[in-house]
Amino acid sequence: GDLLIQKTIKKQVVLEEGTIAFKNWVKTGTEVYRQFWIFDVQNPQEVMMNSSNIQVKQRGPYTYRVRFLAKENVTQDAEDNTVSFLQPNGAIFEPSLSVGTEADNFTVLNLAVAAASHIYQNQFVQMILNSLINKSKSSMFQVRTLRELLWGYRDPFLSLVPYPVTTTVGLFYPYNNTADGVYKVFNGKDNISKVAIIDTYKGKRNLSYWESHCDMINGTDAASFPPFVEKSQVLQFFSSDICRSIYAVFESDVNLKGIPVYRFVLPSKAFASPVENPDNYCFCTEKIISKNCTSYGVLDISKCKEGRPVYISLPHFLYASPDVSEPIDGLNPNEEEHRTYLDIEPITGFTLQFAKRLQVNLLVKPSEKIQVLKNLKRNYIVPILWLNETGTIGDEKANMFRSQVTGKIN
């Protein structure tokens, strides 16, 4: 019996036309939502004038439906048993699942001021930036609507910069009408243990952002894993959002709508400093902000963001070192709300439920030449927002799954 089931599973998880896996892979049958919480800065003047701790108050959730678009340019390659595709991006605001509207205002770090002062470190150029910041009446902080902050706005300071720079700024700009990829993944036809594992991303097996093994594109995209998942496995996956591969480890057995699943979580070790986890040495890219690579829980992805000083962390700096969160007041990290998990059905390797949580932060540093940054006495990794991207198998799909997969086994 088991061999028959294995044979059926192996057949059905192959990524080719006609399989259960393929149908759900091309266009996810699960509704995926991305909730945002924005960190509203309560004391902008005190920070700018006195280098006070930044007092933040999270506001949210503001919810968008995402990942509702089918994969595009799906192309099978029979020669190397891969399938390539683009994952289109789209986000639709869901007012009924949100605390307010996209027109709600927030006081946040001025993204352009923080980024430009980091990118252009030449002192003379910084004096020019200072003039343009002042002329545009920009400051260290700004008031922006949710829509502007997420999806983009024309920045008045950057509009004056005499160099050819993008004048539109937004944390996820550009997003709608763009696509992630090209991904090329193994379809599993010749070897089911490689199904969904990424062969190349944007035509390469490496990212060119990191040194050594940190630069590798490992595992799948976390939507599914090769079948017959064991609790002892370390599940590798690549996330373009954080510009790196990461891994999850088994935490517990969970019953999801009558389907036994394995809950895999991102362990704190994945965010540890090289002192505690030597494997992470290559994610430490500079010595000053990282305090000689002893800080942990924040990932400098500036190389992946055209030099903009973007730092990724878990929400509320969960699993981060005290020095990171010390200059920020109003954070309350807790594992239940702020960690990332994947609920994987072990026979098929399908992720039936997940919660991907991450926080977007921006580094801002003192600058002698830029008046609005002149009074800062320290570097700040400023939280801008955190997000919770979730998906759960629908009741109908769960019934079908139970009857066709788990029911047959039990």
Epitope: Q123, F124, V125, I128, N130, S131, N134, K135, Q371, K374
Partner: antibody, heavy 116, light 107 residues
Amino acid sequence: QVQLQQSGTELVKPGASVKLSCKASGYTFTSYWMHWVKQRPGQGLEWIGEIDPSDSHTNYNQKFKGKATLTVDKSSSTAYMQLSSLTSEDSAVYYCAPIYYGLDNWGQGTTLTVSS
Amino acid sequence: DIVLTQSQKFMSTSVGDRVSVTCKASQNVGTNVAWYQQKPGQSPKALIYSASYRYSGVPDRFTGSGSGTDFTLTISNVQSEDLAEYFCQQYNSYPLTFGAGTKLELK
């Protein structure tokens, strides 16, 4: 538009001090750093130093430390440069120039002659 | 201090000609170079920043190029009003320094 009105020609004796002025208009004086540059007759340009009019923070060329002192008066949007212990080597035209897109606006210059 | 050498003190040209003024830095300054034009009895006028970007209002016959240590200001189709002294300036590091100047004269 940016305008910089510098004080007139100065004729001073060696060993004396002089204070040159540069009155700014057409822009927010405290928003742009002010630079001072020296040009001796028939010679090149030498950077003296810079001042942030918002808080009077200064940076000097090491060569002019002790020679030049930069100050501002925010109320009159005027930058000043005091030159002390004057010698014939200090005879030159002195320019003020605020940083906008660079040193893209210069005053008309003040001619200083040091002679006994 | 970074020394900027403008090897030619004088350059002779005719109206309509193309002329190149050079500037060599004693160490790498990236593209942190500006060019200025100065006519007798006048203040310097900024022409070029970041080695190759023209300030607004500067005629497009003025072109800047170079990076690292070697920089050139090219004036194509020289006009009589271009007869002046040209200075390069580096702002890669302090103190800011200028070249000694190159005077453009009529043949």
